[in-house]
């Protein structure tokens, strides 16, 4: 595995993920056994989990993790202060927000404390490893007889995220999807009044602030349906377990909020 890292002068430096220090011996010693790969993900730039497969070790071993930032003011080697465990064996390390510097090259080193020469070092670009929380507060606005607009919120700097909207009707066998840029708004121009619709959204830290490949989890789905009647606009909303809210500032538009998000607001 190779990781491309940006050097301070902007040049790319392709460096092997693992630097194995081994004894110069013909026989296979403990120190030549490869250490598991460390996988790091930054969750919503609130905390970071760096984990490894502890069960890949030939015998249960409490591997230790050290980290630092290359060529920066934060280049002092730090010990993991919050280990994650799997069956009482270290399997990860959690770093808090203050320890995360997205735009500096993060260096993580895994070590076998019983064999200090058995260690592996990886360099990671954290801005490519951000996973945002799922979008929330999905709302639907009926802009006209046949047009719906979907809006949502993210607990993050919105301009850093791109989004993927999936929608379907009760007649469909597969999702239809549409990419959406940082504006977190999606419009469906032609709605069939005889069908029920379901929408869901996920987000990714790409491309303006990073180049993450991993998407967030999907939002709770929100539904819109055929028997939202003019006489009783609450009919379908209640049947579909959604709450239909009339808001003066919507200029008479109907606004549909998913029940999960409504509960969230009530409890906070």
């Amino acid at each position: 595995l190779n990781t491309t890292i940006l050097t301070p002068n902007g040049n790319e430096d392709t460096t092997a993920d693992f630097f194995l220090t081994t004894m110069p011996t013909d026989s296979l010693s403990v120190s030549t056994l490869p250490l598991p790969e460390v996988q790091c993900f930054v969750f919503n730039v609130e905390y970071m989990n760096c984990t490894w497969n502890s069960s890949s070790e030939p015998q249960p071993t409490n591997l230790t993790l050290h980290y630092w930032y290359k060529n920066s003011d934060n280049d002092k080697v730090q010990k993991c202060s919050h280990y994650l465990f799997s069956e009482e064996i270290t399997s990860g390390c959690q770093l808090q927000k203050k320890e995360i510097h997205l735009y500096q090259t993060f260096v993580v080193q895994l070590q076998d404390p019983r064999e200090p020469r058995r260690q592996a070092t990886q360099m990671l670009k954290l801005q490519n490893l951000v996973i945002p929380w799922a979008p929330e507060n999905l709302t639907l606005h009926k802009l006209s007889e046949s047009q719906l607009e979907l809006n949502w919120n993210n607990r993050f700097l919105n301009h850093c995220l791109e989004h993927l909207v999936q929608y379907r009707t009760d007649w469909d066998h597969s999702w239809t999807e549409q990419s959406v840029d940082y504006r977190h708004k999606f419009s469906l121009p032609s709605v069939d009044g005889q069908k029920r619709y379901t929408f869901r959204v996920r987000s990714r830290f790409n491309p303006l602030c990073g180049s993450a490949q991993h998407w967030s989890e999907w939002s709770h789905p929100i539904h819109w349906g055929s028997n939202t009647s003019k006489e009783n606009p609450f009919l379908f909303a209640l049947e579909a377990e959604q709450k239909l809210i009339s808001e003066e500032d919507l200029g008479g538009e109907q606004k549909l909020i998913s029940e999960e998000d409504l509960h969230h607001h009530h409890h906070h």
């Epitope: 007649w171 066998h173 789905p221 539904h223």
Partner: antibody, heavy 116, light 108 residues
Framework: EVQLVESGGGVVRPGGSLRLSCAAS????????MSWVRQAPGKGLEWISS????????DYADSVKGRFTISRDNAKNSLFLQMSSLRAEDTALYHC?????????WGQGTLVTVSS | DIQMTQSPSSLSASVGDRVTITCRAS??????LNWYQQKPGKAPKLLIY???SLQSGVPSRFSGSGSGTDFTLTISSLQPEDFATYYC??????????FGQGTRLEIK
């Protein structure tokens, strides 16, 4: 005529791995999301996983999440299920089906037996 | 997760009978409900989607109705080839997609 033909099943020990394949013909494969649904001997139907039309997103049942991976190759009209860390309770007939949540067409299934 | 409960679990009927199978969801699923037929040793076959829409090629003696939590599959005049197991399936709140436990329809 629509055809979905599964292969790759067999007998495997607990903790082992298998890769199932499904060859599709008779319909426009990339117009459809695809799914795997299993049926334990003498039991009902259990949805396992679905993948969207372009392979960009997938959903999994909690019972297989982290152990099974669904994928597809639209150029070859093929659907796959990589199964690892298999357990006795994964023993079932595995069907591939067209659609992500409405299953229009089904294969006859391939039998996976997990036994020591 | 949404639970789907079918009733009865099994039933005996004769050719020409009108048969009704019910499916109840643990919460409202609007009309996101599908019905399948499975014969022994065969793959399931889609009969009804969106609660009441007949899949292409399925005989018109099959019909579906219901919305919200309660749904029915009706066979207006039972034919010999209709003896099979029937499953309902919700796709309202996914994942997961969930099926009913099945209703076995046997010859009386």
């Amino acid at each position: 005529e629509v055809q979905l033909v599964e292969s790759g099943g067999g007998v495997v020990r607990p903790g082992g791995s298998l890769r199932l394949s499904c060859a599709a013909s008779g319909f426009t494969f990339d117009d459809y999301g695809m799914s795997w649904v299993r049926q334990a001997p003498g039991k009902g139907l259990e949805w396992i996983s679905s993948i969207n039309r372009n392979g960009g997103s997938a959903d999994y049942a909690d019972s297989v999440k982290g152990r099974f991976t669904i994928s597809r190759d639209n150029a070859k009209n093929s659907l796959f299920l990589q199964m690892s860390s298999l357990r006795a309770e994964d023993t079932a007939l595995y069907h591939c089906a067209s659609g992500e949540f409405r299953f229009d067409y089904w294969g006859q299934g391939t039998l996976v037996t997990v036994s020591s | 997760d949404i639970q789907m409960t079918q009733s009865p679990s099994s039933l005996s009927a004769s050719v020409g009978d009108r048969v009704t199978i019910t499916c109840r969801a643990s919460q409202s699923i609007s009309s996101y409900l599908n019905w399948y037929q499975q014969k022994p040793g065969k793959a399931p076959k889609l009969l009804i989607y969106a609660a009441s829409s007949l899949q292409s090629g399925v005989p018109s003696r099959f019909s579906g109705s219901g919305s919200g939590t309660d749904f029915t599959l009706t066979i207006s005049s039972l034919q010999p080839e209709d003896f099979a197991t029937y499953y309902c399936q919700q796709s309202y709140s996914t994942p997961p997609i969930t099926f009913g436990q099945g209703t076995r329809l046997e010859i009386k």
